[in-house]
């Protein structure tokens, strides 16, 4: 987790002087509770946005937006703490909005936004906005939380972000798999414009099960420049196992930008359709 660039972040708006500060996620009001504290945020919304760094790289960011409740507690509102928790790693990053002037009621509901938390593809987060000062130990909570899911690199908008492109998202191998006679599969895919090797991972399954009945790995050496964007054709021999008929072919590239961690593409061949009605068995067996 990190913030997008380190340029001056602003939270000021007409009628409010405000500055954004780094936070330890442990506001002073936890340690020194105040008697009068503001109510919780209202209508917290988290959306996926995209933002460029000063270097021109494009990153997915969490766009956080919330409004204030229209009660007198805004007179005691000194700011807000924004926290993003990555659920899997338990990594947390916080910033603090520090109000440098007192809030006053005005004809429009106060609305705040922040779009500088960089998030990772295919990761899950919990976003919390705490109004400051935080409540006394037994006081009503004055925060609101929401979960937030970032799509993976197959998502159209994500595909062109810098982290996704670094993992090979722009490569479309357009895999085709056909079943040949004599227990073979022909796999065809488009090579990328890089001299790097590929690996084909074949996993076969029985018709209705998820336990594999056959696994095979095939190495494809790095193509020459004249072979870039060309189709590569590979014939794989299957194990002759009755019912081991559903095949998943996965292609793993080893691009220089992502090495062992590149996005894999896969295609599946289903088992042949069984006829709905089995051939009728005659009541009697002819003797001739």
């Amino acid at each position: 987790l990190r913030l997008l660039d380190h340029r001056a972040l602003v939270c000021s708006q007409p009628g409010l002087n405000c500055t954004v500060k780094n936070s330890t996620c442990l506001d002073d009001s936890w340690i020194h509770p105040r008697n009068l504290t503001p109510s919780s945020p209202k209508d917290l919304q988290i959306q996926l946005h995209f933002a460029h760094t000063q270097q021109g790289d494009l990153f997915p960011v969490a766009h956080i937006e919330w409004t204030l409740q229209t009660d007198a507690s805004i007179l005691y509102l000194e700011g807000a703490e924004l926290s993003v928790l990555q659920l899997n790693t338990n990594e947390r990053l916080c910033v603090r909005f520090e109000f440098l002037s007192k809030l006053r009621h005005h004809h429009r509901r106060w609305r705040f936004t922040f779009s500088h938390f960089v998030v990772d593809p295919d990761q899950e987060y919990e976003v919390t906005v705490h109004h400051l000062p935080k409540p006394i130990p037994d006081g009503d909570p004055n925060h609101q939380s929401k979960n937030f899911l970032v799509p993976d690199c197959e998502h159209a908008r994500m595909k062109v972000t810098t982290p996704c492109m670094s993992s090979g998202s722009l490569w479309d191998p357009n895999i085709t798999v056909e079943t040949l006679e004599a227990h073979q599969l022909r796999v065809s895919f488009t090579l990328w414009n890089e001299s790097t090797h590929y690996q084909i991972l074949l996993t076969s399954f029985p018709h209705m099960e998820n336990h594999s009945c056959f696994e095979h790995m095939h190495h494809i050496p790095a193509p020459r420049p004249e072979e870039f964007h060309q189709r590569s054709n590979v014939t794989l021999t299957l194990r002759n196992l009755k019912g081991c008929c559903r095949h998943q072919v996965q292609i793993q590239p080893f691009f220089s930008s992502c090495l062992n961690d590149c996005l894999r593409h896969s295609a599946t061949v289903s088992c042949p359709e069984m006829p709905d009605t089995p051939e009728p068995i005659p009541d009697y067996m002819p003797l001739w």
Partner: antibody, heavy 116, light 107 residues
């Protein structure tokens, strides 16, 4: 090929405990959390909680708090869910699933029957 | 906790027809909603997340829409393999909760 393979069916007496395992293959266990979801016969799905193999952090459904423990063993890429003080209404198919909010891969399920 | 209500409980549709399934949340869950398909004796399978984004490998005949409290899963032209139970799930807040499911059966 991402796969979550669970341990076999169990029959337990009321008051006993059950420990269901879930072995992850085709990806690194620490890259994503593992969630547990159960389904009583003829009923809908019920979220039980999750564990992060990366941080060890857990989050449990309130109604199971104190009875459920989720653990992982990264050396064997296996997640475990233990449920104690079993009751007849714990009879269900227990699923492990990858991730903590939305579940993109599921185990095949483990039927736990609680009966005296 | 957020209660998810699905309707109808059972939907009878002929192959090739369109199926429209509904899911309602007891409070706003923004777009934090997923749909799953489950066939008898099998684990659920993720179809849609973010209310409208198809999961990897899911055919285009499945589409999701809605935000806030009202959501819809549409199967544009039912295939034989689509007859199953469909469940919605909110992941906006803890605890995560599922709807009771809609069974799509052959008419």
């Amino acid at each position: 090929q991402v796969q979550l393979v669970q341990s076999g069916a169990e029959v337990k007496k009321p008051g006993a405990a059950v420990k269901v395992s879930c072995k992850a293959t085709g990806y690194t266990l620490t890259s994503y959390g593992i969630s547990w979801v159960r389904q009583a016969p003829g009923q809908g799905l019920e979220w039980m909680g999750w564990i992060s193999a990366y941080s060890g952090n857990t989050k449990y459904a309130q109604k199971l708090q104190g009875r459920v423990t989720m653990t992982t063993d990264t050396s064997t890429s296996t997640a475990y869910m233990e449920l104690r003080s079993l009751r007849s209404d714990d009879t269900a198919v227990y699923y492990c699933a990858r991730k903590q909010l939305v579940f993109d891969y599921w185990g095949q399920g483990t039927l736990v029957t609680v009966s005296s | 906790e957020i209660v998810m209500t699905q309707s109808p409980a059972t939907l009878s549709v002929s192959p090739g027809e369109r199926a429209t399934l509904s899911c309602r949340a007891s409070q706003s869950v923004s777009s934090n909603l997923a749909w799953y398909q489950q066939k008898p004796g099998q684990a659920p399978r993720l179809l849609i997340y973010g209310a409208s984004t198809r999961a990897t490998g899911i055919p285009a005949r499945f589409s999701g829409s809605g935000s806030g409290t009202e959501f819809t899963l549409t199967i544009s032209s039912l295939q034989s393999e689509d007859f199953a139970v469909y469940s919605c799930q909110q992941y906006d807040n803890w605890p995560l909760t599922f709807g009771g499911g809609t069974k799509v059966e052959i008419k």
